[in-house]
Interface confidence: low
């Protein structure tokens, strides 16, 4: 069986496959995917291996109409080094000479200058060309070699060895070379991969069952760190409470040197956040911490000074923590679309479940905002994921130059953020530089700022606006807002307008529905149309909503109803495959994710139309 | 920040054409709709045309079939040709885009400075 590095390279001109009868004589033959000889992989950047020889594709020179053989795998050969060309065209390094199918008195594979259908190859039973299945490098655990890469294939006991063994050892532990030659350079470290044995590489926190792997031997840079932990299944550690620290800190002690964490603030115009995406609502700074330097976005734990943080330049070579199992937040489920009653009070503006409410004129310290909100039934507003955040910017009313209160604090556990109105944080968004927390400076509760809405730790003293929250009252009339530029029962955002469509309808029938409405099926230009859709439809009982996406007009090719360009695609797991069919969005778990059905399937749809007079808030004078 | 730079405005006859370009450049990562609107002396700014990336269009009821509105993406140029000028298409025009800094932000609103159009005989 073919694993998931391995690929066959099939010409579909002649429909065979490039076939290695031996060394020295490439050719082709009916493709057969369990054939051994038609088997290869990417084994660096630019290296392609026969899996049947362990050896690599190369030529003996770099001149027109040479024969390609196999040779020993030499990273530093400029003769095995290839390259995916635009389309399907796999060519020799820097050079415009091709991997060409030969002739009829030439049978073996061969480099040629032409780049025509003869030179065109594709991965067997895709439509990828060979670079889709490429390298992908496996940093090693514990071992000699600092954490460095696995080099494929390398030779042990005079053997070749094209995948991580447990060849010479007899704990079954698997393990793989970082240089090509292990008999003569003895660097090696274990495999990030499942083997018996492989969990006692991972200690487990009795009290969550959360897993924590120390690599401080190894000397990565952050992103090959995060790497490394990504291939486990794992992610670089994040730290959301308190437990969680203590346990690190007694796991460290041990250790001197710093530590990766996933903490970094490498969006661009973000704050600090978790790579995992946990919520950053823990703060454990070194004093001094976060320095301002400008290139310092990733963060190291530091097991000598108490296992606080600092940050530092992300190409610093460093040791890391890798975490997976059982996340430690709690468990926290949004309201499903049939629990969410609509009705809101007047002014107030109604989102899965609740009602929202922005307080822009009157300001009031923290506190006082806190007991206004909760004397009108509510609370100062928790925002639990970013489609409730994109709904109070986008439909609120809010403004780019607002500083809102929300119900983010720190004003019980310092250093540790809360909502106030009892709720668990599963979601954070901080402004660049955010939270700041400077210690000359009491702030302890956090506002919304900006064009964005994204978050500020403040003094709670000063007197501001604030955004209320409260669960939506299940009797009475739903209110129907007219939005200025849409008709009565569409939705705005940004530039325009949109409607469930309610009836169970085909693709064709949805379609001649909305264009009855001057309208059309949705198109989704980019991930914020589609985290607004993903809010408007992701938490309704129904299973499906179609867009205007098919690949009706050419098999293969989707396209929208409307003549717009395919820029952004969402689709789901397995998804378009190879079925011709119409686009519809999940909700549920899934919610937002594109399936293709069939469609004469019956389901609800989303129709879509320019706003009228479209126009944005006067440009500011400066 | 993003900086929108108009150009190609100036006098014309009634009847006449003009084509405005603007360009977009600094920090963008990623720009969604581009658009012109116009404001007249004493009157409110309103939309005349505008374009997504993907090429869909919308353009004001009052030019319809003599403005056309297009777009280089490559080039973050969005471009406005203005056939059968009236007088009361005088206006100063100002280029509109929403546009994206880095992948994982909200698209906000920019504004070029202005470039005069002056439809009289």
């Known amino acids: 069986l073919l694993d998931t590095r391995q690929f066959l390279i099939y010409n579909e001109d002649h429909k065979r496959c490039v076939d290695a009868v031996s060394p020295s004589a490439v050719q082709t033959a009916a493709c057969n995917q369990d054939a051994e000889s038609q088997k290869f992989r990417w084994v660096s950047e630019s290296q392609i291996m026969s899996v049947a020889f362990k050896l690599c594709l190369g030529v003996p020179s770099k001149t027109d109409w040479v024969a390609i053989t196999l040779y020993a795998c030499d990273s530093k050969s400029e003769f095995q080094k290839w390259e995916c060309k635009n389309d399907t065209l796999l060519g020799i390094k820097g050079e415009d000479l091709f991997f060409n199918y030969g002739n009829r008195q030439e049978k073996n594979i061969m480099l040629y200058k032409g780049s025509g259908l003869w030179s065109r190859w594709k991965i067997y039973g895709t439509t990828d060309n060979l670079c889709s299945r490429g390298y992908e490098a496996m940093y090693t655990l514990l071992g000699n070699a600092n954490g460095a890469t696995c080099a494929f294939p390398f030779k042990f006991e005079n053997k070749w060895y094209a995948d991580c063994t447990s060849a010479g050892r007899s704990d079954g532990w698997l393990w793989c070379g970082t240089t090509t030659d292990y008999d003569t350079d003895k660097l090696f470290g274990y495999c990030p991969l499942k083997f018996e044995g492989s969990e006692s590489l991972w200690n487990k926190d009795p009290l969550t069952s959360v897993s924590y792997q120390i690599n401080s031997k190894s000397a990565l840079t952050w992103h090959q760190a995060r790497k490394s932990c990504q291939q486990q299944n794992a992610e670089l550690l994040s730290i959301t409470e308190i437990h969680e620290q203590t346990y690190l800190t007694g796991l460290t002690s041990s250790l001197t040197s710093g530590l990766w964490i996933g903490l970094n603030s490498l969006s661009f115009n973000s704050g600090w956040q978790w790579s995992d995406r946990s919520p950053f609502r823990y703060l454990n700074w070194l004093p001094g911490s976060p320095s301002a330097e400008p290139g310092k976005s990733c963060v190291s734990l530091n097991p000598g000074k108490n296992a606080k943080w600092e940050n530092l330049e992300c190409v610093q070579k460093l040791g890391y923590i890798c975490k997976k199992g059982n996340t430690t937040l709690n468990s926290f489920v949004i309201p499903s679309e049939s629990d969410v009653p609509t009705h809101c009070p007047s002014q107030w503006w109604p989102y899965a479940g609740h009602c929202y409410k922005i307080h822009r004129d009157e300001k009031k310290i923290q506190r006082d905002a806190l007991t206004t909100c909760r004397k009108e039934g509510g609370d100062l507003t928790s925002i639990h994921t970013i489609e409730e955040l994109d709904f109070i910017i986008s439909q609120l009313g809010y403004e780019p130059n607002d500083e809102l209160w929300i119900g983010l604090n720190d004003i019980k556990i310092q250093m540790y953020f809360e909502w106030s109105d009892g709720t668990p944080v599963t979601f954070t968004k901080w402004l660049r530089g955010e939270p700041s927390h400077e210690n000359n400076r009491q702030e302890d509760c956090v506002v919304m700022k900006g064009k964005d809405g994204y978050w500020a730790d403040r003094g709670c003293e000063w007197p501001l606006g604030y955004i209320c929250k409260m669960k939506s009252r299940s009797q009475g009339p739903e209110i129907v807002e007219v939005e200025k530029g849409c008709r009565k029962g569409w939705k705005k955002h940004h530039f325009y307008c949109y409607m469930i469509g309610h009836t169970l309808s085909t693709f064709a029938e949805a379609n001649q529905t909305c264009n009855n409405e001057n309208a059309y099926l949705t198109t989704i230009e980019d991930r914020y149309e589609q985290a607004f859709l993903t809010s408007f439809v992701g938490l309704r009982p129904e299973k499906y909503f179609w867009t205007g996406l098919s690949d009706i007009q050419t098999k293969g090719t989707f396209q929208w109803t409307i003549e717009e360009e395919v820029r952004f695609t969402h689709w789901n797991s397995d998804m378009p495959g190879r079925k011709p069919g119409c686009v519809a969005m999940r909700t549920g778990i899934a919610g937002g994710l594109w399936d293709v059905l069939k469609c004469d399937e019956k389901a609800k749809f989303v129709c879509k139309h320019w706003a009228e007079g479209v126009t944005h808030p006067p440009k500011p004078t400066t | 920040q993003v900086q929108l730079q108009e150009s190609g405005g100036g006098l014309v006859q009634p009847g006449g054409s003009l084509k405005l370009s603007c360009a977009a450049s600094?920090?963008?990562?990623?720009?969604?709709?581009m658009g012109w609107y116009r404001q007249a002396p004493g009157k409110q700014r309103e939309l005349v045309a505008a374009i997504t990336s993907g090429g869909s269009t919308n353009y004001a009821d009052s030019v319809k079939g003599r403005f056309t509105i297009s777009r280089d993406n490559a080039k973050n140029t969005v471009y406005l040709q203005m056939n059968s000028l009236k007088p009361e298409d005088t206006a100063v025009y100002y280029c509109?885009?929403?546009?994206?800094?880095?992948?994982?932000?909200?698209?906000?609103?920019?504004w070029g400075q202005g470039t005069q159009v002056t439809v009289s005989s």
């Open positions: 509109n885009a929403d546009g994206v800094v880095a992948w994982d932000q909200p698209y906000d609103n920019y």
């Open positions: 600094g920090s963008i990562f990623s720009i969604k709709t």
